[in-house]
Interface confidence: medium
């Protein structure tokens, strides 16, 4: 079976405050079985932004239907962006288990927030 790749093609995304940001992430294999999670930042201080198996995440919607078994697109849209949302976002595949364990991370997408146009 093909080795899993987590593809985050955008190195950075710039969005005006109040707008929505789309963060792209696709995977190249359905294996190993387990959820995708999005985090802002890395290391112990990282913040969970979206978990495929938890929720709700009121400002986050998935771009495609992630509940479909064959889905490989885990891009998300974050609404009503504020300066506090700036940072690097990582799309991370977890291996199913008790608990789920981190398997592989995308390279990250840096979100910068522009001032709202006057």
């Amino acid at each position: 079976e093909e080795e899993l790749q987590i593809i985050q093609p955008d190195k950075s995304v710039s969005v005006a405050a109040g707008e929505s940001a789309i963060l792209h992430c696709t995977i190249t294999s359905l294996f190993p079985v387990g959820p995708i999670q999005w985090f802002r930042g890395a290391g112990p201080a990282r913040v969970l932004i979206y978990n495929q198996r938890q929720g709700p995440f009121p400002r986050v919607t998935t771009v495609s239907e992630t509940t479909k078994r064959e889905n490989m697109d885990f891009s998300i849209s974050i609404s009503n962006i504020t300066p506090a949302d700036a940072g690097t976002y990582y799309c991370i595949k977890f291996r199913k288990g008790s608990p789920d364990t981190e398997f592989k991370s995308g390279a990250g997408t840096e979100l910068s927030v522009r001032a709202k146009p006057s």
Partner: antibody
Amino acid sequence: DVQLVESGGGVVRPGESLRLSCAASGFTFSSYDMNWVRQAPGEGLEWVSLISGSGEIIYYADSVKGRFTISRDNSKNTLYLQMNSLRAEDTAVYYCAKENNRYRFFDDWGLGTLVTVSS
Amino acid sequence: ETVLTQSPGTLTLSPGERATLTCRASQSVYTYLAWYQEKPGQAPRLLIYGASSRATGIPDRFSGSGSGTEFTLTISSLQSEDFAVYYCQQYYDRPPLTFGGGTKVEIK
């Protein structure tokens, strides 16, 4: 204006080594990921290697993995490619290419330096 | 690895004619596709990125279209300086970043 000037090419025998340099000017070098791309005579473009602005992230094409080493000196605004165990199929013009700051396409290229591997 | 296939290999046209170059990807690259022009003794030059956005300073006779796996570079009216080799490059599935094999546009 962005300028990328490659140097260090030449004629070597199979198994020998060569070090290419790319002197960059006209932009904040440390803020940009840099690449080496090559073109064998009469052939198309082939991506060789990538290094992030900080030098922490490095990738190689399978064809050069284990033989070539990419590095950079941000204090000197210079990109390097150390080529060891050279083979005839490494004969090519080697281009230094600056990545766009948002995506992995190449905004600017040097004129290239020719590496010939021949016995 | 995403394979890019360019066609035709060579396009023989006269100045003033329209050139249509095609690039096909082995899997979807969405719109993460760039086009470059290469002339002998010169550095490759970025023409198009994002499948359809012209790079700075590129004349509007160059246009790009497509998404997913099928892409087209069109030169609406060939000028003498447009006779060159053109390459597509995907930057969605990376690394490795991959290029097409090139299309040579030559004078009839």
